[in-house]
């Protein structure tokens, strides 16, 4: 398969490289080793070398898997077999280098590797902060409410996504083919483990998007569909968040196994199969974007009225908008309509960098915005800290005879302010919980 300009796609290039290596192994198995001192035949991840007599220079044609093979088909690769019958360090691949874009493949590989380093840092940081945020929301009972239960599930989905991606990267074969400085050690990882990690990654990424959708739907319900209790809906949210991804991941696994069962399923050459996963994700991105626009409209009208008593309403609107972006994954909409097949070169790397950077650090941002700098959470932590210090100081003071230490009364009111949906006001009108909801989120 080639792209519009007749250039080999990375996926096909990898398959051709793999095929070249397999052919080499077969050839070497059927070749008789020479009787005298000689260097062993081998596939060195670049070219196929036959058994070579000691103290001579081996010569093989440029490997046919190279995308520019036509231009270098007359060229050779050289390698020196030492006097001791061992391959030396001396070699020369220069006749097989891309005559047009020398080093372009190395440059691409380098960009991809830098992106991988960036998202590894992002996901690792997200994983750490999300775990801490999850612990905080779990440990403080007074923070338990539907809103925070949804946050906790979103945090979990972000953590699973990060863990799955980082695990999958460890099991994937290195980038190939290896004309640059990244010549790999042979890939011996068990394919089953790698594919399992790939399936888990797709599920966790899917779950992450559906939980972003749940956040959007829940917020939309609170602000727009007023008068209904949210308590009963939480089960539906759970089912949507963790169940919906299975509805498209399982069909993808079946079709992939039957129609495109190649390597670790990391390359998507048959685009129709990839759309099984891509379509639902694009739909969630679109729905969340529409919800975001709707919420923004509500925000604008709220902030414009005196109800909010906010003179710096533009600043407040900007802050609220930026706060909602990571929670709803709105940034995804920027490049969502642009598929990887439609873009090439710099724009493709810009798309990759934008999506990968924001996706990997999104978990970190969400945990900071909706846990660490949340006023309710901060006041709970402060209160918990005060209680702890008080207990320690009371333990130090020995109680006198007949004197009991009365436990400090803890207010029963929840620190987690659920929006007062459906509260009847004296006027008999329904109280719209917009202010409280927006306070909690924005």
């Amino acid at each position: 398969e080639t792209d519009s300009e007749g250039q080999t796609t990375t996926g096909e290039l990898y398959q051709r490289w793999e095929h070249y290596g397999q052919e080499c192994q077969k050839m070497l198995e059927t070749t008789e080793p020479p009787s005298g001192l000689a260097c062993n035949g081998s596939f060195d991840m670049y070219a196929c070398w036959n058994y070579t007599a000691a103290n001579t220079t081996a010569r093989v044609s440029c490997p046919w898997y190279l995308p520019w093979f036509r231009q270098v088909s007359a060229g050779f690769v050289f390698r020196q077999c030492g006097s001791d019958g061992q391959w030396g360090s001396w070699r020369d691949h220069t006749q097989c280098e891309n005559p047009e874009k020398n080093g372009a493949f190395q440059d691409q590989t380098l960009i991809l590797e830098r992106l991988q380093i960036m998202y590894t840092v992002g996901y690792s940081l997200s994983l750490t902060t999300l775990l801490l945020a999850l612990l905080i929301l779990s440990l403080f009972r007074r923070l338990h409410c539907t809103r925070n239960y949804i946050h906790m599930n979103l945090f979990t989905s972000f953590m699973l996504r990060a863990a799955a991606i980082l695990t999958r990267d460890q099991l994937l074969p290195p980038l190939g083919p290896y004309t640059g400085d990244q010549a790999p050690t042979p890939w011996n990882q068990a394919l089953a483990a790698c594919r399992t990690a790939q399936i888990m990654t797709q599920y966790c990424v899917g779950a992450n998007y559906t939980w972003l959708l749940v956040e959007g739907v829940y917020l939309h319900h609170l602000l727009v569909i007023v008068g209904r209790s949210e308590k009963g809906h939480f089960r539906c949210y759970l089912l949507l968040g963790w169940g919906a991804p299975a509805l498209f991941v399982i069909p993808w696994v079946i079709v992939r196994y039957l129609r495109e069962n190649t390597q670790c399923w990391e390359r998507n050459e048959v685009k129709a199969i990839w759309w099984i996963i891509r379509t639902p994700i694009l739909i969630t991105i679109l729905i969340n974007f529409l919800i975001f626009i709707r919420i923004l409209g509500i925000l604008v009208s709220k902030l414009r009225t005196r109800q909010m008593r906010c003179p710096d309403y533009r600043l407040r609107l900007a802050r609220s908008t930026l706060t909602l972006v990571p929670l709803l994954g709105v940034h995804e909409v920027v490049f969502a309509p642009v598929t990887e097949e439609q873009v090439e070169g710099s724009l493709r790397f810009a798309k990759l960098a934008f999506e990968i950077f924001l996706s990997s650090f999104q978990g970190f941002l969400v945990s900071v915005l909706y846990c660490f700098i949340n006023k309710e959470v901060q006041s709970e932590i402060r209160q918990g800290w005060r209680h702890r210090r008080l207990r320690l100081s009371l333990q130090e003071q020995r109680p006198r005879p007949h004197q009991e230490l009365a436990p400090r009364a803890v207010p029963l009111s929840s620190a987690c302010r659920e929006a007062a949906v459906g509260n009847a006001l004296p006027s008999g009108m329904l109280h719209v919980p917009g202010d409280e909801v927006l306070e909690s989120y924005c």
């Epitope: 690769v77 061992q86 001396w90 020369d92 691949h93 220069t94 990244q182 010549a183 790999p184």
Partner: antibody, heavy 119, light 113 residues
Amino acid sequence: QVQLQQPGAELVKPGASVKLSCRASGYTFTSNWMHWVKQRPRQGLEWIGEINPSNGRSNYNEKFKTKATLTVDKSSSTAYMQLSSLTSEDSAVYYCARFYYGTSWFAYWGQGTLVAVSA
Amino acid sequence: DVVMTQTPLSLPVSLGDQASISCRSSQSLVHSNGDTYLHWYLQKPGQSPKLLIYKVSNRFSGVPDRFSGSGSGTDFTLKISRVEAADLGVYFCSQSTHVPPFTFGGGTKLEIK
């Protein structure tokens, strides 16, 4: 990018030994031979030897066969060169170097370690 | 072992002038594959050597086109068309045709006149 990191200097007494290190990063350590080169003050460059990190096999310049021993630690992507029975003649800057992938010319060099042999 | 001899030992030049460094090998550097493995390196003061030219005349990536290499067999030349301050340092020729060992020339110091 490819980087070869070496410590700045080593001060040793005559007759003693010294083990120089060269930590590699930015590429697959085991897929490229590591070379060592000596440079005495205001003099040319001398090739000491090379080592294949994937199997530890090495080749030496006859002149340095009894002087230098090359080893690698794959887990830390580090190449080592031990110099024994040091004399003032061994006072020099020692570089680790690596070919450009698939070639036989040195495209990547460490910063060099100055070995000063002095009583 | 192949002996590499460089001349001159020191080359004083004025900025903007052309400089020419010669390198001679004790035996032909034409490999059995037909290629000639003669390379040039520049070592600036306090730095490690840097590759300039490989296989007689091929500039390494990032090397300005002021640098050019020529020659065949046993006689080779490095030319710098318009010398700049950044070009000052010691130039070494090196061969990797008959190896091991890889051998280097004694060096030519390019300095301001």
